[in-house]
């Protein structure tokens, strides 16, 4: 889980090693702060939980791409 020790900087110290279906993910944000030990992606799930993931993993990249497309597609 993300850790905000020195708010407002949120850092990830561990990544999930389970692949999560993109259909359980609602949004994401990238963590690139130099105050954090590693770059990370924090996914917010459909039930508003937050998951730290490794941006180098393919499933993470694919999920970000999917969520990007989802937000670009206007609902009819």
């Amino acid at each position: 889980q993300p850790d905000a020790i020195n708010a407002p900087v949120t850092c990830c110290y561990n990544f999930t090693n389970r692949k999560i279906s993109v259909q359980r993910l609602a949004s994401y944000r990238r963590i690139t702060s130099s105050k954090c030990p590693k770059e990370a992606v924090i996914f917010k799930t459909i039930v508003a939980k937050e998951i730290c993931a490794d941006p180098k993993q393919k499933w993470v990249q694919d999920s970000m791409d999917h969520l990007d497309k989802q937000t670009q597609t206007p609902k009819t």
């Epitope: 889980q1 999930t16 090693n17 389970r18 692949k19 999560i20 279906s21 259909q23 359980r24 609602a26 799930t45 459909i46 039930v47 939980k49 998951i51 499933w59 989802q70």
Partner: antibody, heavy 119, light 113 residues
Framework: QVQLVQSGAEVKKPGASVKVSCKVS????????MHWVRQAPGKGLEWMGG????????IYAQKFQGRVTMTEDTSTDTAYMELSSLRSEDTAVFYC????????????WGQGTLVTVSS | DIVMTQSPDSLAVSLGERATINCKSS????????????LAWFQQKPGQPPKLLIY???TRESGVPDRFSGSGSGTDFTLTISRLQAEDVAVYSC?????????FGQGTKVELK
């Protein structure tokens, strides 16, 4: 292809504990979210709990809270479900179940382990 | 918890006829942002583990015959077997996977008439 092979049938006395194992092959347990489902004779399926990557921990159905413990031995790719303080109503088939990509439904199931609780 | 209620509890259908099973959830399992319904259907034969038939309410699992179809949205769902075969005699259960705890319907037993 994920394969789940469970331990054999058990007969237990009321008040005892039972530990059921589920051996994973074709995939690494640490990459899966293993869950456990039970089915009493002639009854429906009942989710007991499992590893929830959204929480980053194992979660349990309230009904079993305090009486069930689910653990993993990643060195042998084996998941375990221990149920304590057994009573006759716990007589059931217990299944481990998973999916390679966590969604909440399961496409791989163990063969089931019958646990009979009888004095 | 989301309560899943199936109807009927059992039904007898002639070979080649249609079987319809209903599943109702106590609250919506539709996530409006992606228009997905978090509902699955399973088939279970005696002495066997459940077999996934349908997920996302209407997506057929690979290898499942096309006589099985799922429909519905929100709180009301249906599993249809268009032309019942002898091997379809089983218990069918729905499951919601929107919010933990995951919950199943009580099951519907399909028999031959």
């Amino acid at each position: 292809q994920v394969q789940l092979v469970q331990s054999g049938a058990e007969v237990k006395k009321p008040g005892a504990s039972v530990k059921v194992s589920c051996k994973v092959s074709g995939y690494t347990l640490s990459e899966l979210s293993m869950h456990w489902v039970r089915q009493a004779p002639g009854k429906g399926l009942e989710w007991m709990g499992g590893f929830d990557p959204e929480d980053g921990e194992t979660i349990y159905a309230q009904k079993f809270q305090g009486r069930v413990t689910m653990t993993e031995d990643t060195s042998t790719d084996t998941a375990y479900m221990e149920l304590s303080s057994l009573r006759s109503e716990d007589t059931a088939v217990f299944y481990c179940a998973t999916k390679r990509e966590y969604s909440g439904y399961f496409d791989y199931w163990g063969q089931g382990t019958l646990v009979t609780v009888s004095s | 918890d989301i309560v899943m209620t199936q109807s009927p509890d059992s039904l007898a259908v002639s070979l080649g006829e249609r079987a319809t099973i209903n599943c109702k959830s106590s609250q919506s399992v539709l996530y409006s942002s992606n228009s997905k319904n978090y509902l699955a259907w399973f088939q279970q034969k005696p002495g066997q583990p459940p077999k996934l038939l349908i997920y996302w309410a209407s997506t057929r699992e690979s290898g499942v015959p096309d006589r099985f179809s799922g429909s519905g949205s929100g709180t009301d769902f249906t599993l249809t077997i268009s032309r019942l075969q002898a091997e379809d005699v089983a218990v069918y259960s729905c499951q919601q996977y929107f919010i933990t705890p995951w919950t199943f319907g009580q099951g519907t037993k399909v028999e031959l008439k």
